[in-house]
């Protein structure tokens, strides 16, 4: 059964900036990846992110940069400074679709003890 | 404007073979997943085949598990489903129908469909 | 496999009343969930996708909404090309599923 995983960074160097790493471990062909926050995208959450392998990268504030790291995961910088800006115990969720199995999520947030700089 | 048109269906005798052709055109066929979906006289929607848009990746139910193959040719723009064995149980309607990555793969284009009757 | 129930299976309705249509699915879906019309002779339609989602061109009166497992359509005044078979579709997993479709017919 493909999986999903998911990292949540706090940058070391901006306190308030975080970077979201999420991968698909699994034999199909990655299709879309949609990264929200607050919950799964068809759970209440906000989409941060839309990430497709041919048609390219949509994100809305606060995202500043998503890319793809290899075919099958990607990441997520966020932007530290603002009213919509992410606090220490936000969920992050990351779905990818795949075809024809169809799609798998996971969601993390920033571990309470974590220091900055250290993966969750 | 997307059209897909449906060709290839007819009658046919329990045991026999058809091979039905769907033309793509006014959009990149290439970069679309791609799907078969027949309605059975007085039933329900069915989604009997699909295909990755690489060709890489297929999809069947069960019930044509081993009797149909799904294919394209992404240089002609054309999609194909190869049915052998056919049984009584297979006489529908057949579309060709075109799967949308951000719409989570709901179908956005169908063809008018081709007839497929299996009767001695 | 996910099997998606819809009800009821028919509806006698007037023109100009207000319609929902209900759709459950066997285990969640998340928001992987269209809803599709189709009339005799025609290929199906999309409407919505993504739940609520309005495909282009489909008029405002129709409109999606639901989470997880339970999903309805709702058309606000049924126009008289409004009557025909309407199926919910979830292409979450493998094996994508349709429901047995709700047909809408005059009264």
């Known amino acids: 059964t493909p999986e999903v995983w998911v990292q949540v960074r706090m940058e070391a160097t901006e306190l308030s900036s975080f970077t979201i790493r999420c991968g698909f471990l699994g034999s199909g062909s990655i299709s879309l990846v949609t990264v929200s926050w607050g919950g799964p995208n068809g759970a209440g959450g906000t989409t941060l992110a839309v990430l497709h392998p041919e048609r390219g990268i949509r994100q809305w504030a606060p995202a500043r940069q998503a890319r793809w790291e290899t075919q099958s995961s990607i990441s997520l910088i966020l932007e530290g400074s603002g009213a919509s800006s992410p606090c220490a115990n936000t969920t992050f969720c990351c779905k990818f679709a795949s075809f024809p199995e169809g799609s798998w999520e996971a969601c993390g947030s920033l571990p309470p003890s974590s220091d900055p700089g250290l993966s969750a | 404007e997307v059209q897909l048109v449906e060709s290839g269906g007819g009658l046919v005798q329990p045991g026999g073979s058809l091979r039905l052709s769907c033309a793509a055109s006014g959009f990149t066929f290439s970069s679309y997943h791609m799907s078969w979906v027949r309605q059975a006289p007085g039933k329900g929607l069915e989604l009997v085949a699909a295909?990755?848009?690489?060709?890489?990746?297929?999809y069947y139910p069960d019930t044509v598990k081993g009797r149909f193959t799904i294919s394209r040719d992404n240089a002609k723009n054309s999609l194909y489903l190869q049915m052998n064995s056919l049984r009584a149980e297979d006489t529908a309607v057949y579309y060709c129908?075109?799967?949308?990555?951000?719409?989570?793969?709901?179908?956005?284009?169908w063809g008018q469909g081709t007839l497929v009757t299996v009767s001695s | 496999e996910i099997v998606m129930t819809q009800s009821p299976p028919t509806l006698s309705l007037s023109p100009g009343e207000r319609v929902t249509l209900s759709c459950k699915a066997s285990q969640s879906v998340s928001n992987d969930v269209a809803w599709y019309q189709e009339k005799p002779g025609q290929a199906p339609r999309l409407l919505i996708y993504?739940?609520?989602h309005r495909f282009t061109g489909i008029p405002a009166r129709f409109s999606g909404s639901g989470s997880g497992t339970d999903f309805t359509l709702t058309i606000s005044s049924l126009q008289p090309e409004d009557f025909a078979v309407y199926y919910c579709?979830?292409?979450?997993?493998?094996?994508?599923?349709f429901g047995q479709g709700t047909k809408l017919e005059i009264k």
């Open positions: 993504y739940v609520s």
């Open positions: 579709h979830q292409a979450y997993r493998s094996p994508w599923t």
């Open positions: 129908s075109r799967h949308e990555d951000y719409f989570g793969f709901a179908m956005d284009s």
């Open positions: 295909i990755s848009r690489d060709g890489d990746s297929t």
